[in-house]
């Protein structure tokens, strides 16, 4: 057994209920809200996390628009419908039968409609731009050190392979992390960039989803990197369909 299995907790998701009722008495963890069994060696999907979070909703995420096709998450938190794999269902509806289509990170990408609304497919968010502003430091961080540290962080903490970290841009005090991942690029076991971005966002807000691990302690050559604000831009493989400019 791993240490996590010995005390039966889920290292990658504290919003779970765990018990030793898996095969051979092994620790098995289920996401709150949905009861879906999760793999605690990797990130839990954002859909299951949002479902679990609905028991104690926090402030909504804000997305900023880098171009005409970017989405702004003005709708805040909602209780999502997830498919058996834990992904967002393409169509989401609320209790009053208002429905809308979402992308793979659960952000609305169409006007709201009624139960007759059709969402043919779950459109993939293939490009995520994480825009950070760090607190003032004695001097600027070395760009290549910063790049290496962020790639290491995304691999070790979020299990995202560095191939999906397309670039790290830096103009003090702004850091931009570009994540790119087409559907065809994902191999078995590869973490989804949307899930990695969501975990990272929660970490920088001081709302870590990890069990028993300390909060995010980002250092570049020993110098603490403290994030003041985060903005996340999501771009889909197919542009969103709204009836008018928002």
């Amino acid at each position: 057994h791993t240490a996590a299995q010995d005390n039966c907790t889920c290292p990658t998701n504290k919003m779970t209920v765990c018990s030793p009722d898996g095969p051979g008495g092994r620790c098995q963890c289920r996401a709150l809200g949905s009861g879906v069994a999760v793999d605690c060696s990797t990130l839990t999907s954002e859909c299951l996390l949002l479902k679990a979070r609905m028991s104690a909703p926090k402030n909504a995420r804000t997305l900023v628009r880098p171009n005409e096709h970017a989405l702004v998450d003005n709708d805040g938190l909602y209780d999502p419908d997830c498919d058996p794999e834990g992904r967002f269902k393409a169509r989401q509806c609320n209790q009053t039968s208002v429905c809308w289509c979402v992308n793979s990170v659960g952000v609305r990408r169409t006007d709201k409609g009624d139960l007759s609304l059709r969402c043919d497919e779950l459109v993939r968010t293939h490009h995520i731009l994480i825009d950070l502003r760090h607190r003032p430091t004695a001097g600027a961080f070395n760009h290549s050190d910063l790049d290496a540290e962020l790639r290491r962080l995304f691999r070790e903490r979020y299990r995202l392979h560095p191939k999906f970290v397309a670039a790290v841009h830096y103009e003090q005090p702004t850091i931009q992390i570009e994540l790119r991942q087409n559907t065809s690029q994902k191999a078995a076991g590869d973490v989804d960039i949307g899930d990695a971005a969501y975990y990272f966002e929660r970490d920088v807000k001081g709302e870590s989803l990890f069990q028993g691990r300390g909060g995010l302690d980002l250092r570049v050559r020993g110098e603490p990197l403290q994030v003041e604000r985060t903005l996340i831009y999501y771009l889909d493989e197919i542009p969103p369909k709204f009836s008018m400019k928002r």
Epitope: H1, S41, P162, S184, Q185, K186, A187
Partner: antibody
């Protein structure tokens, strides 16, 4: 079932290049990472590099940069590793192995190709 | 790079014995530790992944445990077919992924 087929042996002269092959069967070739591992006689295992067949992304152990080049042919579900400027230090068994993105565990291995560099 | 150390390079045991092979990482690898068996003919097989998960088709006499930097592979009831060299490997950090030096298991 999953199979990775490699030729048993290759004999090449010092200074030459060789292209080792690894034919994948029993799974969707583009859905898994492919890794290559070196084992010198009586020694341990050494990771050379990895490739994703879907987009030809490669990453190498610094030690093998310039020595090994990984490629794939999706149409035949075959991975290749070219080794250049061969010396006696390159004489070894070379394994191809299928990898998992999260655990980075190598769940199926080829039988290995024994490369002998000799004049 | 993370160094993986298998202090015991060879081990002698009797059939039916309980055998434990250990592996130490140069830093915390958060359970991303895998174990492989290499038979004398060179055939390599995955036994255990993510510290303690048994790969499909592997007999239940094999088990893994550990955390942080220290990990172990246990064979609960040694059989003749288990005579092989065993390697640990970490998949935690950025490439390169590294292996231990191996532990050769022999029959007394």
């Amino acid at each position: 079932q999953v199979q990775l087929q490699q030729p048993g042996a290759e004999l090449v002269k010092p200074g030459a290049s060789v292209k080792l092959s690894c034919k994948a069967d029993g799974y969707i070739f583009t859905s898994y990472w492919m890794h290559w591992v070196k084992q010198r006689p009586g020694q341990g295992l050494e990771w050379i590099g990895e490739i994703t067949p879907s987009d030809n992304y490669t990453s190498y152990n610094q030690k093998f940069k310039g020595k090994a080049t990984l490629t794939v042919d999706k149409s035949s579900s075959t991975a290749y590793m070219q080794l250049s400027s061969l010396t006696s230090e390159d004489s070894a068994v070379y394994y191809c192995t299928r990898g998992h993105g999260n655990y980075v565990s190598f769940d199926y291995w080829g039988q290995g190709t024994t490369l002998t560099v000799s004049s | 790079d993370i160094q993986m150390t298998q202090i015991t390079s060879s081990l002698s045991a009797s059939l039916g014995d309980r055998v434990t092979i250990t592996c130490r990482a140069s830093q915390d690898i958060s359970n991303y530790l895998n174990w492989y068996q290499q038979k004398p003919d060179g055939t390599v097989k995955l036994l255990i992944y993510y510290t303690s998960r048994l790969h499909s088709g592997v007999p239940s006499r094999f088990s893994g445990s550990g955390s942080g930097t220290d990990y172990s592979l246990t064979i609960s009831n040694l059989e003749q077919e288990d005579i092989a060299t065993y390697f640990c490997q970490q998949g935690y950090t950025l490439p390169p992924y590294t292996f231990g030096g191996g532990t050769k298991l022999e029959i007394k």
